[in-house]
């Protein structure tokens, strides 16, 4: 028996099998779908990408296509030879051995083979066209790459020359820097030497200044006495001249006023002719007890006895009742004159009180009370003030009516708290009142939001701590 069968083998290739008696003829056709599926990066019939492929990818694709074309050509030639060689023999045998209808089968096979060949030829034509298309694209890309390469080479050359120029400049600058470093090192060494010399000089000057300050204090006191003596001598000379020129000089009695060598306040010193600001010795009223005070002979006509001064925080003002009573600190700097002396002084004559204030922003203000006095110790040195004028607030920052004086060890305020303990320093606290010029000294930038600082509420508010303060008194009739 004989039959004809068309099938697909396990690899997916098409095969034609002819069975004729004991002989079986199998024709394996080449794979016509040799182009991969569209998921492959090398698609045969897919639309070309906009972005050019890498040069290596293009070459690879071209090699694949050339290989496929060569394989197909070789296969066709083999097939042709095979048909020519083998079909002649087979045809003779068939003619001899099979009946007429086998001829029809062979014709069908031949037709099928011709059709396959024609199809294969068309495919090859397509492949050739694609290869040509791809080759053209690759040539264009290669041309573009070549142009780009030339441009890049030119740019690289330009950049190389720029780099060379920069390197030359850099070398020049490096040399300059090295030269400057050398000079700077020399200058620094010189400056260090100068600094050391200056430090030695400063320390020498500091000790000289200390000595001078001591001498100044002595000189000021001596100067005061000399001025007084000069004033007294002038008075004596004038008195003698008057007596000598008088027609009744023989009957005149030369009564010399007793020399005033003690002063109760700075106003008396000023009026005696001593008009230089400085430290003077004052005497308690009705007593021989003395106290040193700073006299301001410049502000508002002079004659001011300074009873309090703050300027730098060098003196601790959180003191006892006894210390505030007797006074503390240095009249040249920060100090409290003493409640007892001020009480006695202001209890005998009418005095005015001037308070000078400075803030940390360079502003100054003052408050002037036209009547000021302190009660005695039995009344806790209660303050009495009237007649406020000035620039440090229209309302008095010292509570009205006056409060008793309080210290850390003597609580006489009107608060269920201890104002002096809490707000620091001795003062005429109410509960605790709008001021405290004896509070904690806070330096600049630390002087705000501090309720225990140097406070004058009606000028700077509750939490502002002042830079400097001076309290001074003078007789109202000066």
């Amino acid at each position: 028996y004989s039959n004809f069968r068309k099938s697909v083998d396990s690899t997916g290739r098409r095969q034609y099998q002819v069975q004729n008696g004991p002989c079986s003829y199998t024709f394996l056709l080449p794979e016509t779908d040799s182009c991969r599926s569209s998921s492959s990066p090398y698609m045969s019939n897919a639309v070309q990408r906009d972005a050019p492929l890498d040069y290596d990818d293009s070459v690879q694709r071209l090699q694949v296509l050339e290989n496929i074309l060569e394989n197909n050509t070789q296969w066709l030639m083999k097939l042709e030879n095979y048909i020519q060689d083998n079909m002649k023999k087979e045809m003779v045998e068939i003619q001899q051995n099979v009946v007429q209808n086998q001829t029809a089968v062979m014709i069908e096979i031949g037709t099928s083979l011709l059709n396959q060949t024609a199809a294969q030829t068309r495919k090859l034509t397509d492949v050739e066209a694609q290869v040509l298309n791809q080759t053209t694209r690759l040539e264009l890309q290669l041309l573009q790459h070549s142009i780009s390469t030339n441009k890049l080479e030119k740019q690289i050359l330009d950049q190389t020359s720029e780099i060379n120029k920069l390197q030359n400049k850099n070398s020049f600058l490096e040399q300059k820097v090295l030269d400057m470093e050398g000079k700077h090192s020399e200058q620094l060494q010189s400056m260090k030497e100068q600094k050391d010399e200056l430090q030695v000089l400063v320390s020498k000057q500091s000790s000289v200044i200390d000595e001078l300050e001591k001498k100044l204090v002595t000189a000021t006191v001596n100067n005061s006495l000399l001025q007084k003596q000069q004033h007294d001598l002038m008075e004596t000379v004038n008195s003698l001249l008057t007596m000598m020129s008088s027609p009744n000089s023989k009957s005149s009695v030369a009564i010399r006023k007793e020399e005033q060598t003690t002063f109760r306040d700075c106003a008396e010193i000023f009026k005696s002719g001593l008009t230089t600001s400085g430290i003077y010795t004052l005497t308690f009223p009705n007593s021989t007890e003395e106290i040193k005070a700073y006299c301001d002979m410049d502000v508002g006509g002079g004659g001011w006895t300074v009873i309090q001064h703050r300027e730098d925080g060098s003196v601790d003002f959180q003191r006892t009742w006894k210390e505030y009573k007797e006074g503390f600190g240095s009249p040249l700097g920060e100090y409290w004159l003493g409640n007892e002396f001020v009480s006695q002084l202001t209890g005998q004559h009418r005095y005015v009180l001037k308070i000078q204030l400075k803030d940390w922003e360079g502003n100054e203000a003052h408050s002037l009370y036209d009547h000021f006095y302190l009660a005695g110790e039995e009344s806790n040195y209660r303050i009495h003030l009237t007649g406020l004028t000035g620039t440090a607030g229209k309302i008095s920052s010292i509570s009205q009516p006056g409060s008793d004086f309080s210290t850390k060890d003597s609580d006489n305020d009107k608060c269920i708290c201890k104002c002096s303990q809490m707000l620091s320093g001795g003062w005429w606290f109410d509960a605790c009142g709008p001021s405290n010029l004896n509070g904690q000294y806070y330096p600049q930038k630390q002087n705000t939001n501090k309720f225990n600082g140097i406070k004058w509420y009606y000028w700077k508010g509750s939490g502002y701590s002042l830079k400097a303060t001076t309290m001074m008194i003078r007789p109202a009739d000066f």
Partner: antibody
């Protein structure tokens, strides 16, 4: 003697208003910051509002902001709390309190009023 | 807001015995002026609160010296050296460093 005498409490419906007063005596009222503090039944203390001595600075608790208004009349030595849009959770004893220190130094409450009960209920 | 936490919430004490109440704040109450902004109040039954201790450790006038306050930063203590019958009530700590001022939950002191 320092005294703070309160008035104005009572029962009020939710959404309605009430005004509390606090009359001060025995000290310079115009020198002190004043506060309102409340205490819900069986609960702890809760700060409500503050006004400085001059009335220039005012603070409120978030829970009452926009509904309550604190004010003072230094000439009459009086402190006020206007309470609008009252809620059930505003039910409490309300105390007025004086700063311990004068001139707006916030260091605690030296004196307290006797308290006045505000009940918000329908 | 600063949170204040007291302990214990209830404190039964025998008269004559000491008592101690702790108060903790969620952040430091120490001001740059050196003071701790913490106060202690006592609210006796049926009365308004009264100030005992201000600024951490300062006893208010009229407060018996058996009461003392201590601590700094975030940890504070109120001590009663010898409890008396009149000391019963609720003790509150309060911070005044920041607005809003805030109170602890209260500690109820009762006599055994």
């Amino acid at each position: 003697e320092v005294q703070l005498v309160q008035s104005g409490g009572g029962v009020v419906q939710p959404g309605r208003s009430l005004r509390l007063s606090c009359a001060a005596s025995g000290f310079t009222f115009s020198s002190y910051g004043m506060h309102w503090v409340r205490q819900a039944p069986g609960k702890g203390l809760e700060w409500v509002s503050y006004i400085s001595s001059s009335g220039s600075t005012i603070y409120y608790a978030d829970s009452v902001k926009g509904r309550f208004t604190i004010s003072r009349d230094n000439a009459k030595n009086s402190l006020y709390l206007q309470m609008n849009s009252l809620r059930a959770e505003d039910t409490a004893v309300y105390y007025c309190a004086r700063d311990l220190l004068d001139y707006d130094i916030l260091t605690g409450y030296g004196y307290w009023g006797q308290g006045t009960l505000v009940t918000v209920s329908s | 807001d600063i949170v204040m936490t007291q302990s214990p919430l209830s404190l039964p004490v025998t008269p004559g015995e000491p008592a101690s109440i702790s108060c903790r704040s969620s952040q430091s109450l120490l001001h740059s002026n050196g003071y701790n902004y913490l106060d202690w109040y006592l609210q006796k039954p049926g009365q308004s609160p009264q100030l005992l201790i201000y600024l951490g450790s300062n006893r208010a006038s009229g407060v018996p010296d058996r009461f003392s306050g201590s601590g700094s930063g975030t940890d504070f203590t109120l001590k009663i050296s010898r409890v008396e019958a009149e000391d019963v009530g609720v003790y509150y700590c309060m911070q005044g460093l920041q607005t809003p001022p805030t109170f602890g939950q209260g500690t109820k002191l009762e006599i055994k």
